[in-house]
Structure formats: C-alpha cells, structure tokens
C-alpha cells in the first residue's frame, strides 16, 4: 500500500485516551521518550499528539478508476521531530526521532469500528494494532474482524484548544 | 465501477413496517463503513444509520431509534434499513452510501439513486 | 449532538461571479467536514472532503476552507452547470448535515 501524497490531506492536535478513560502521556527520560498509559489526577494537563492523515492506495484488483480502494494511514507526533513508531519484532511501541520522509513503521493505517474511538494498524505488519497491555503501549495481533472491537486497541481522541505543537 | 442500488420503496400505511435492500457491486464491500440518508420531499439530507464494516455495531439519530434496524450480509454485499411503526413524516426518497474510506466513518464517497418511501393511508 | 447551520439558504449569483457559501457548526470538528452537490432529480455527489479535498473528478473551479466551527465552499467562477444544493455534512461527531443552501443564476 503507498501514501498517495506526501503532504497529509488534513492534521490536527488531541489528546490520546483509551477506552477506559486513561491517558496516555509521554515523558523525557535519559533522553529518550518514554509512553505510559495512566489514571491522570483531576485537572491535570492531557498530553496532546499531532495527528497527520494521509491517503493511501490500497492494493486491490478492484475495478473503478482509482477513486476506490482508498485508506487512511495516521502518523502520531506527541513533540516535534519525534513520531510513534511500530517496533514488529519487540511488538511494541516506541517513540523515535526521525525525518521527513517518515519510515513506514511510523504509519498507521486507521480503523473506527465504534463512532467514538479509533484503532491503529501497523502499516508494516497487517493484523497488528497499537493496544494497552500491562500500564503500556504494546503491539497486539488482532485475529479477526469481530476482534477490532477489543477495548484494548482503541482509543478516544479528544479535541484541544490549543493549536500550537510543542 | 461502483454501483448502489436501493430496492423495497412504495407506499405503505402509517404504523406498518417496510424492508429497503442496497446491492452494490465494484468495491470491497466488507472493508466500507454503509449508511442510510433519506431526504423529505423539497428538503434537505437526514442521517438515518451506519454500520461498520463487520456489522458490529449500528448508530441512529433519536428520530429513528427503536424503529428502524440497520443490517447487512457480507456475502451478498448488500446492507438493508428494516423500518416499522412508519410514520407519516418517514415519507422520504432513502438514499444508501458507502464510506469514501477502508474502515473509517469519514466521508460519503458514493451513492445510490434513492428509493422513495411514502407514509399515507 | 453537533448541529450545522449553512447560509445564505439560497443564493443568486452571475455566470463566473465568485460565489461563497458557509457552514457554522455548533463545536469544534477538527475539519471533519464535506461538502455535498445535489442537482434536481439526482443523488448528492462528494465534492470536497476533510474540508479542503477535492474528490477526484471535481473541477478545480470549487475549494473548500475552514477550522474549528467555521467553514467555506468557493466557487471561483460559477458555471451554468453549478445550479444545485449544496450541503455540508460533519463526522467529527456522530453524522449531521446542514441544511443546504440553493445556488440559482441571475
């Protein structure tokens, strides 16, 4: 499947949750990021990530002229210049600086299967989605399509005020 | 090429119920979020339903909620709005859509021709 | 529920008059937002998605802007063939259209 632009055709700012109402937050440690999923005391302040929509053709023998078969892949940015990024053989994920253009272990395709919440597919490792497992960030093998409504792979984005990407 | 067809319209007395179809043909249909929007007489558009790909889970505005059940086959790539207890304001053409991406609710890319629904005794 | 207002509901305007409809929603949509082209007797047609994306297809002659709440179609040059109903439609939230508005020539 290939990005159709390199320009993303819409992004915007949001706090990242699950669907258990924790949060999750990033943390600079030893110079490097660290993702934790949380309980966030009354008041305190949501970590916001950059959402970066782009399309990308899907690799189909549909017939149509191209309009089809289309698909949304996210690459997620909690600060500037770094990006989360799919680790297949740790099954996990990281946060990673990089440069335009973004390594596909940094796309992720997008799924709703709630009106509310959103899952994230590894663009390089079809069938596996970013989910919670133990207090973390994990990659999880998602085994069928009933299996896309697990409370585990998804997340609530909720809108900010707050327009600026630090 | 993508095709949307809405079958099961016509007239029908208030407080019965009525079946509508979509067959579609030309995408991948399991992969599409689908959606009823019907249109009144010389008015606007209204959201009736949508269901995901994997028919799991179904969303209605409050004006149809309880009346009208959304649905559809994977195998017969085909969705259906099972409407009961019509009332004369569901008078209306009833249009099926797909979504305009794989697995998102994001966008009405395509469109049927509509099926007119009448209400009246 | 997210509700969208669009103006003017209808609209008069000259062949390759410069033409802007608007769209208010009622909350932020993070540009969640479509925008619809009916003509009489036919289906709505996508014009333009995530608020300024033109679907394949479509002349360059439309665009569309906006954030938050607030939302625009341009027509650059209105053509004969641009007499219809154009609606705005969000899916930040749920799914609402707005009302429509009715573009005529002069």
């Known amino acids: 499947m290939s990005i159709t632009g390199i320009s993303p055709i819409t992004e915007y700012l949001a706090s990242l949750s699950t669907y258990n109402d924790q949060s999750i937050t990033f943390a600079l440690e030893d110079e490097s990021y660290e993702i934790y999923v949380e309980d966030l005391k009354k008041d305190e302040k949501k970590d916001k990530v950059l959402l970066s929509y782009y399309e990308s053709q899907h690799p189909s023998n549909e017939s149509g002229d191209g309009v089809d078969g289309k698909m949304l892949m996210v690459t997620l940015s909690p600060t500037k210049d770094f990006w989360l990024h799919a680790n297949n053989k740790e099954h996990s994920v990281e946060l990673h600086k990089s440069e335009k253009p973004l390594p596909d272990q940094a796309f992720f395709v997008l799924h709703n299967m709630h009106s509310n919440s959103v899952s994230f597919e590894s663009k390089t490792d079809p069938g596996v989605f970013i989910g919670v497992k133990d207090n973390h960030l994990a990659l999880i093998k998602v085994d069928s399509s009933e299996n896309l409504s697990t409370e585990n792979i998804l997340f609530k984005l909720s809108e900010t005020h707050h327009h600026h990407h630090h | 090429e993508v095709q949307l067809v809405e079958t099961g319209g016509g007239l029908v007395q208030p407080g019965r119920s009525l079946k509508l179809s979509c067959k579609t043909s030309?995408?991948?249909?399991?992969?599409?979020?689908m959606y009823w929007i019907r249109q009144a007489p010389g008015k606007g558009l209204e959201w009736v339903s949508s269901?995901?790909?994997?028919?799991?889970?179904?969303y209605y505005p409050d004006s149809v909620k309880g009346r009208f059940t959304i649905s559809r086959d994977n195998a017969e790539n085909t969705i259906y709005l099972q409407m009961s207890s019509l009332r004369s304001e569901d008078t209306a053409t009833y249009f099926c859509a797909k979504g305009h991406y794989y697995y998102t609710s994001y966008s009405l890319g395509y469109w049927g021709q509509g099926s007119l629904v009448t209400v009246s005794s | 529920d997210i509700q969208m207002t669009q103006s003017p509901s209808v609209l008069s305007a000259s062949v390759g008059d410069r033409v802007t409809l608007s769209c208010k929603a009622s909350?932020?949509?993070?540009?969640?937002l479509d925008w619809y082209q009916q003509k009489v007797g036919e289906a709505p047609k996508l014009l333009i998605y995530?608020?300024?994306n033109l679907q394949t297809g479509i002349p360059s002659r439309f665009s569309g802007s906006g954030s938050g709440t607030d939302y625009t179609l341009t027509i650059s040059s209105l053509q004969p063939e641009d007499v219809a109903t154009y609606f705005c439609f969000q899916y930040n939230s749920g799914w609402t259209f707005g009302q429509g508005t009715k573009v005529e020539i002069k």
């Open positions: 269901i995901t790909p994997n028919g799991g889970n179904t």
């Open positions: 909350h932020n949509i993070n540009k969640h």
């Open positions: 995530f608020t300024n």
């Open positions: 030309g995408f991948t249909f399991s992969s599409y979020w």
